[in-house]
Structures are given as structure tokens and as C-alpha cells.
């Protein structure tokens, strides 16, 4: 898709980063084998991918976590892919839910989310989880990205 | 994306194959409803997808497996998507981990991996698992592919 | 990929819908934050995505379900992505299997399927599950889509 200057490739793939913040929004970094095609997609504040051009994007996230049923709330572990468009409320695009494992001390599970969505200029996407402390940040386990169709 | 001769579509989707080899690298075949767009991507030695052109690729793998917690080591089942570029060491692109099931004799689980990565000419990608004997090779359960953006 | 009139973008993302039908084929709707790029892909009878143009498509589905091992059959929960081409038998493209959870009243799990396939004009893809009553229809949990390369 060498699309020429008028229609360049737009793609990103960022890597999870452990954070001391208590927010449920996962943190990401341009590290390891990351992708950031050009400045038409940017990682802002380490938490959201923001696009400059309107269009259809395939957006994906993968989250690996380790949890135990007895040590967790009864609610499952939920990962949510969310959208914030300029002048609009946040909205959920995709969610996945996995009940906590009975394995001790914790059982690892991986979630994958992905779908095609229309994004407006300045739109941002980010990933929320129920308990960030359970997320695995080992090489390749948790990542987030998009590509413009 | 009929891209013309200068910029043809490049895509592959290959199907898992049971193997007598004791290696942790999964084996694949061009069988069933497979995809191999042209010779700009090839399946080499039944184990790796190799690309001829540099660029951004969305690479994915799905692995279904059946395992039992009592019969397994404490380590989870891990599937890894790995990259070997010419003149470089192998590196992990993506991993997923699932703790073994308590179901007897084994419990089935499916893992999906996918992300956007820059590949160099001659780069190969392959899939590693902790125990190939646990992998499910029934129709559609385990597959591997890529597409060039 | 502003491809021009000759080669327009073709993409869809549809949202799960609870159904009173006893069929194992999941039902979908153009609701919420859905995508339907143009009339070259259509949602037919609320159950299948049908394409008008031949080519390579990345097709995906995500299914979240809640089940319990004691209350379910011994067979795992299986989600299948299926293809019906004109004048051909249905065939399975992708499947994922997850053994039922021991959590009570039920344990949630999410499945993601995705792959690159050649579709003929008039081909339809749909999603089958072993027990539709176990599927979660909350915002973002279960969705289905495709994009033409």
C-alpha cells in the first residue's frame, strides 16, 4: 500500500507499560518492536492513540492478565476498547470478559479485541481494564494498535 | 486494493498440521481453505511465513489447545508469535498465556494473537507453543496468517 | 485507502442481537457504533454478511459467553466462522473452543476469531455457536465484521 503522499499508510502498535497510576486506563510506550508509521497517528500521554485523518480503521488490543477467583471481586476481568471523539462523550467500542481463574496464586489468561470503526480527525482510542495491577507486562503479552484501511 | 503490478496484494492464511517433530514450533500447510496470494509470501519448511517485500504487515495466529492443570507443569500454556529477520536474532512479537483448565481429561481453550509490524525483505514469522501435543488440529481451530498493508 | 470509485473501501462491523430463534446462527444488527461502508457489503436477514465483489477479505468475530460446567453438556462452547458461497456447500473457516467455567452461576469468557480469506461475489459469512442462550449481548461484547484488502 505505498499509497503516495496523498494517502500514506497509517498504522501503530504500542507496548504495555506498568504504571503507578491508579487509573483503569492502560499505559503504553513506543518501545521494543513498536510501530508508529508517521505523525498521522500519535501516542498521547502514554494512554491513547490519536488519529489526524478521518476514515475507517481496524483497531485492536491484546491484554494478558493474572488473577485468582478467591482474591478478586466476583465481577470478571473486563478489558474495554474505548473511543473519545472531539466534542463527544466517551463510548465503548469493544469489550471482553474473562472470569477469574481458580489457579493459585493466579491464573493467566489472554484477551484479544479487534474491529473496524470510523474515526473522526482528532479521535482517540484507549484501553480500560477492571484491575490494571493484574495485567502482565512481559514481552509481547499486552499491546494495542490500529491500521487505517 | 487491486494495487497493480507495482503494488500487488500480499496475504497468507495457513492451516495447522499435526507433526511428529518434537520442536515447539508449530507446523502449517497450504490445505483446506488456505490463502497464498502470490510468491511475495511463502510458507517455508511448513513452519514459517517469509515475505519478499519490506513493509507493514498485520500478522495473526490462532491456537486452540486442550490441557489439564493436574497433568501439566505449573507454567501456563504460552503461544508466541516470533520474528526472524536476516542477520538478526529471533525476537518475540506477541505472546498469549492461558493457565491450564481443571476440566478432565483436558479443557479446550483458544488463543488469538495479532498486531502490525514492520518486516524486512526475507523476514520470517513463526509460532511457538509450550506443548505442541496439546494443540487442536481440527478444522478451523488453529491457523496463522498475515496481510501487507 | 481512498481507493477511488473503481476500488472503494469495503468494510463492515455489526453488533450482536439477542434472538428468540432457536438456531445456532448468531443474529446481528446495524446499531450502536456499527460500520457499513457501502452497498458492496450487506447484512442479510440479520445473520450474514454478504459481499458483492471477489477478493481477499480479513474476516473477524468476537463472542463473549457465560456458561457453567455443571449446567452445560460436556462438549465445550464452540464459535465457528462459516462461509456460504453461491452454488457451494457451507464450510467452516475458523473455530474456537472454550471449556465451560466452574464459576457459579456462570463464568464469562471471550473468544476472538480472525483470518484472511478469498470470497467470491455473492459469498456470505456467518457465525455459529453451540449455545446462543449463553452469549453476552452487552455493549461491545459480541461483534462481527470484515474488511476488503
Amino acid at each position: 500500500m505505498q499509497k503516495g503522499d496523498q494517502n500514506p499508510q497509517i498504522a501503530a502498535h504500542v507496548i504495555s507499560e506498568a504504571s503507578s497510576k491508579t487509573t483503569s486506563v492502560l499505559q503504553w510506550a513506543e518501545k521494543g518492536y513498536y510501530t508508529m508509521s508517521n505523525n498521522l497517528v500519535t501516542l498521547e500521554n502514554g494512554k491513547q492513540l490519536t488519529v489526524k485523518r478521518q476514515g475507517l480503521y481496524y483497531i485492536y488490543a491484546q491484554v494478558t492478565f493474572c488473577s485468582n477467583r478467591e482474591a478478586s471481586s466476583q465481577a470478571p476481568f473486563i478489558a474495554s476498547l474505548c473511543l473519545k471523539s472531539p466534542g463527544r462523550f466517551e463510548r465503548i467500542l469493544l469489550r471482553a470478559a474473562n472470569t477469574h481463574s481458580s489457579a493459585k496464586p493466579c491464573g493467566q489468561q489472554s484477551i484479544h479485541l479487534g474491529g473496524v470503526f470510523e474515526l473522526q480527525p482528532g479521535a482517540s482510542v484507549f484501553v480500560n481494564v477492571t484491575d490494571p495491577s493484574q495485567v502482565s507486562h512481559g514481552t509481547g503479552f499486552t499491546s494495542f494498535g490500529l491500521l487505517k484501511l | 486494493m487491486q494495487k497493480g503490478d507495482q503494488n500487488p496484494q500480499i496475504a497468507a492464511h495457513v492451516i495447522s498440521e499435526a507433526s511428529s517433530k518434537t520442536t515447539s514450533v508449530l507446523q502449517w500447510a497450504e490445505k483446506g481453505y488456505y490463502t497464498m496470494s502470490n510468491n511475495l509470501v511463502t510458507l517455508e519448511n511448513g513452519k514459517q511465513l517469509t515475505v519478499k517485500r519490506q513493509g507493514l504487515y498485520y500478522i495473526y495466529a490462532q491456537v486452540t489447545f486442550c490441557s489439564n492443570r493436574e497433568a501439566s507443569s505449573q507454567a501456563p500454556f504460552i503461544a508466541s508469535l516470533c520474528l526472524k529477520s536476516p542477520g538478526r536474532f529471533e525476537r518475540i512479537l506477541l505472546r498469549a498465556a492461558n493457565t491450564h483448565s481443571s476440566a478432565k481429561p483436558c479443557g479446550q481453550q483458544s488463543i488469538h494473537l495479532g498486531g502490525v509490524f514492520e518486516l524486512q525483505p526475507g523476514a520470517s514469522v513463526f509460532v511457538n507453543v509450550t506443548d505442541p501435543s496439546q494443540v487442536s488440529h481440527g478444522t478451523g481451530f488453529t491457523s496463522f496468517g498475515l496481510l501487507k498493508l | 485507502m481512498q481507493k477511488g470509485d473503481q476500488n472503494p473501501q469495503i468494510a463492515a462491523h455489526v453488533i450482536s442481537e439477542a434472538s428468540s430463534k432457536t438456531t445456532s446462527v448468531l443474529q446481528w444488527a446495524e446499531k450502536g457504533y456499527y460500520t457499513m461502508s457501502n452497498n458492496l457489503v450487506t447484512l442479510e436477514n440479520g445473520k450474514q454478511l454478504t459481499v458483492k465483489r471477489q477478493g481477499l477479505y480479513y474476516i473477524y468475530a468476537q463472542v463473549t459467553f457465560c456458561s457453567n460446567r455443571e449446567a452445560s453438556s460436556q462438549a465445550p462452547f464452540i464459535a465457528s466462522l462459516c462461509l456460504k458461497s453461491p452454488g457451494r456447500f457451507e464450510r467452516i473457516l475458523l473455530r474456537a473452543a472454550n471449556t465451560h467455567s466452574s464459576a457459579k452461576p456462570c463464568g464469562q469468557q471471550s473468544i476472538h476469531l480472525g483470518g484472511v480469506f478469498e470470497l467470491q461475489p455473492g459469498a456470505s459469512v456467518f457465525v455459529n455457536v453451540t449455545d446462543p442462550s449463553q452469549v453476552s449481548h452487552g455493549t461491545g461484547f459480541t461483534s462481527f465484521g470484515l474488511l476488503k484488502l
Epitope: - | 499435526a18 507433526s19 511428529s20 489439564n68 501439566s72 481429561p105 496439546q134 487442536s136 | -
Partner: nanobody, 118 residues
């Protein structure tokens, strides 16, 4: 095509013993487990025991109801599994099915009847 064939079933008195065998034939590339299920009249098929090879070689797993009475073993070179059943009870009466995860798929035998009765 891989096939599983059971043998060794029959009539036995309570407290008695039987040994079941299951032989796998065909082109076998990999095995995760070989084991046994059983189905009593009017009941669902239930897990009995399994012997694991692959990366879990040497492990065995049993249903609670047969622990201490039944022993599963396997001869991996012959792709054969054995179930030694001791201290049999009338409630062990069932059709016993060999099951195996071979070449990445679940396979079943045709079953052999075990009757425990005085």
C-alpha cells in the same frame, strides 16, 4: 484414519478385578493423553482416568470416584493404554470407552461392557 480398539470387558463379582486395554492404530504423530470414560445405563458419559504424554509425560489424573481402586498406565511405544480396575462395585457397571487426544483431536473407541454383579 486413527482408530481406538478396547478389550478386556466382561462380567465380574463385586470386589473383583478386571484389566481393560486400548490400542491406537493408524498414523499417529502426537499424543497428549490416552484415557477412559464410562457410561452407565440412563446416565451421562463420565471421565474415569487419563495418562498424559507430550510435555506432561508420566502424569495421571483420576475421577474422585475411582481414586485408589483404578490404575491407568500407558505403553507409549505401542500407543496402548491399560486400566487396572480393582475392588469393583456394582456402581462401576457401565460401558467403558477409550478416549485419546491424538494428532490434535479427540478420538473415541466403540466401548467395552463391564458388568459388576453377584
Amino acid at each position: 484414519e486413527v482408530q481406538l480398539v478396547e478389550s478386556g470387558g466382561g462380567l465380574v463379582q463385586p470386589g473383583g478385578s478386571l484389566r481393560l486395554s486400548c490400542a491406537a492404530s493408524g498414523r499417529i504423530f502426537s499424543t497428549y493423553f490416552m484415557g477412559w470414560f464410562r457410561q452407565a445405563p440412563g446416565k451421562e458419559r463420565e471421565f474415569v482416568a487419563a495418562s498424559y504424554t507430550g510435555g506432561s509425560g508420566g502424569s495421571t489424573v483420576y475421577a474422585d470416584s475411582v481414586k485408589g481402586r483404578f490404575t491407568i498406565s500407558a505403553d507409549n511405544s505401542k500407543n496402548t493404554a491399560y486400566l487396572q480396575m480393582n475392588s469393583l462395585k456394582p456402581e462401576d457397571t457401565a460401558v467403558y470407552y477409550c478416549a485419546a487426544w491424538l494428532n490434535g483431536g479427540n478420538r473415541w473407541g466403540q466401548g467395552t461392557l463391564v458388568t459388576v454383579s453377584s
